[in-house]
Interface confidence: medium
């Protein structure tokens, strides 16, 4: 697994414990909370970082409508149980044997239960929509600059083929960033936009999971765009299942 | 590569405590759990606990709790088990083993040798 | 807790053999089974984990399947460094819990 040779840390993931471990005295690192071992030339799974993140000690408008099956992620924080590839199990339980099914970011897609509850596969999550609002500036930013600066930060920072990136919307404060990847689309290496979108989200929160890389530094024709929100939906390939007490 | 080496043969006798020790080599101490499993002569394999290495908190089996302790040195890569109270169904061979932090890396891919634990008067 | 029981306790094989060793919880685990090789003398090896991941260096003969609570171990063609005892073993929920171990024997 790649790392940086030189200190022997993790660039895309400062939540491992790196050693020259591997075949030849190579740097090798591993996630916090899992021991597992990871790949430092691409982003970690999320399930990792949470998994990590539960470990460390505590401290009718062109914007685009989500529809009645997005799921928004409110339950916060969970120490998840991940496959040996590192992603979400489709079934997660607690301590005090309450399980529930997620999706492939790892998002409750189902009410509670108990033990006998079956998850029967892990639902792709395929499309993603971030919800930004930015500080107030001395005028809007020009849509095609905000586009494109976006789009390169998604490919340079955490290594997304463009293809996935299918929209910027700008109606200011408002910024909507719609990731789209199906099951068959996304190819062998390719970064999850799962994986991305987690990252970007932490990013924005000041909480960069990059290895000593400066916080996120987002300018659009050298204005600072600085986010003070930041909401998440996602989208599943089969619709989730609530009853309709949750719903109401 | 990767090694777990434990402390040698004891003879007890019941009523004293026994502790084991388990040097890791070859990994990170801190990137993995430690646990600890016994094996009476002609048994199978019973869990005792393990110990979260990067937090240092352990866990124990019901059925140990109260006369088990799971410890660890980082400085020196070194995890513990010590058993007081000891009795003749005690004796066993006590094994160290890697494993990961969470329920899906409780597999145990590195083994130590083994320590045999005769408890007798 | 939960109780893993494996099926046969022990076993009469020949080399060139496919065998298969079965292994049944008593509540769901997921896919959080281990499969272990014992010889006589010597600490237990891992060979499957998660029910059906390969650990590295096992040969492929070995094979894992099963999810909830019914797990298999199969080797597709017994080689004479096989035969030995093997353990099951769920890590799914603390306490962790073996099987009582399948003994397999040169016929």
């Known amino acids: 697994h790649t790392a940086a040779q030189d200190n022997c840390t993790c660039p895309t993931n400062k939540m491992t414990v790196c050693s020259p471990d591997g075949p030849g005295g190579r740097c090798q690192c591993r996630a916090l909370g899992s021991g597992v071992a990871v790949d430092c030339s691409t982003l970690t799974s999320k399930c990792l970082l949470l998994k990590a993140r539960m470990s460390a000690p505590k401290n009718a408008r062109t914007l685009v409508r989500p529809n009645e099956h997005a799921l928004v992620d409110n339950d916060g924080l969970y120490d998840p149980d991940c496959d040996p590839e590192g992603r979400f199990k489709a079934r997660q339980c607690n301590q005090t044997s309450v399980c529930w099914c997620v999706n492939s970011v790892g998002v409750r897609r189902t009410d509670k239960g108990d033990l006998s509850l079956r998850c029967d596969e892990l639902v792709r999550t395929h499309h993603i929509l971030i919800d930004l609002r930015h500080r107030p500036t001395a005028g809007a930013f020009n849509h095609s600059d905000l586009d494109a600066e976006l789009r390169r930060l998604f490919r340079e920072r955490y290594r997304l083929h463009p293809k996935f990136v299918a929209a910027v919307h700008y109606e200011q404060p408002t910024i909507q960033i719609e990731l789209r990847q199906n099951t068959s689309q996304k190819a062998a290496g390719d970064v999850d936009i799962g994986d991305a979108a987690y990252y970007f989200e932490r990013d924005v929160k000041g909480e960069s999971l990059f290895q000593g890389r400066g916080g996120l530094d987002l300018r659009v024709r050298g204005e600072p765009l600085q986010v003070e929100r930041t909401l998440i939906y996602y989208l599943d390939e089969i619709p989730p299942k609530f009853s309709m007490k949750r719903l109401t | 590569q990767v090694q777990l080496v434990q402390s040698g043969a004891e003879v007890k006798k019941p009523g004293a405590s026994v502790k084991v020790s388990c040097k890791a080599s070859?990994?990170?101490?801190?990137?993995?759990?430690m646990q600890w499993v016994r094996q009476a002569p002609g048994q199978g394999l019973e869990w005792m606990g393990w110990i979260n290495t990067h937090s240092g908190v352990p866990k124990y089996a019901e059925d140990f709790k109260g006369r088990v302790t799971i410890s660890a040195d980082t400085s020196t890569s070194t995890a513990y088990l010590q058993l007081s109270s000891l009795k003749s169904e005690d004796t066993a061979v006590y094994y160290c083993?890697?494993?990961?932090?969470?329920?899906?890396?409780?597999?145990?891919?590195?083994w130590g040798q083994g320590t045999l634990v005769t408890v007798s008067s | 807790d939960i109780q893993m029981t494996q099926s046969p306790s022990s076993l009469s094989a020949s080399v060139g053999d496919r065998v298969t060793i079965t292994c049944k919880a008593s509540?769901?685990?997921?896919?959080?089974v281990a499969w272990y090789q014992q010889k006589p003398g010597k600490a237990p090896k891992l060979l499957i984990y998660?029910?059906?991941y390969r650990y590295t260096g096992v040969p492929s003969r070995f094979s894992g399947s099963g999810s909830g609570t019914d797990f298999t171990l199969t080797i597709s063609s017994l080689q004479p460094e096989d035969f030995a005892v093997y353990y099951c073993q769920q890590h799914y929920i603390t306490p962790l819990t073996f099987g009582q171990g399948t003994k397999l024997e040169i016929k």
């Open positions: 509540q769901d685990v997921s896919t959080a």
């Open positions: 083993a890697r494993s990961g932090f969470g329920s899906s890396y409780w597999y145990f891919d590195v």
């Open positions: 070859g990994y990170t101490f801190t990137t993995a759990g």
């Open positions: 998660s029910a059906s």
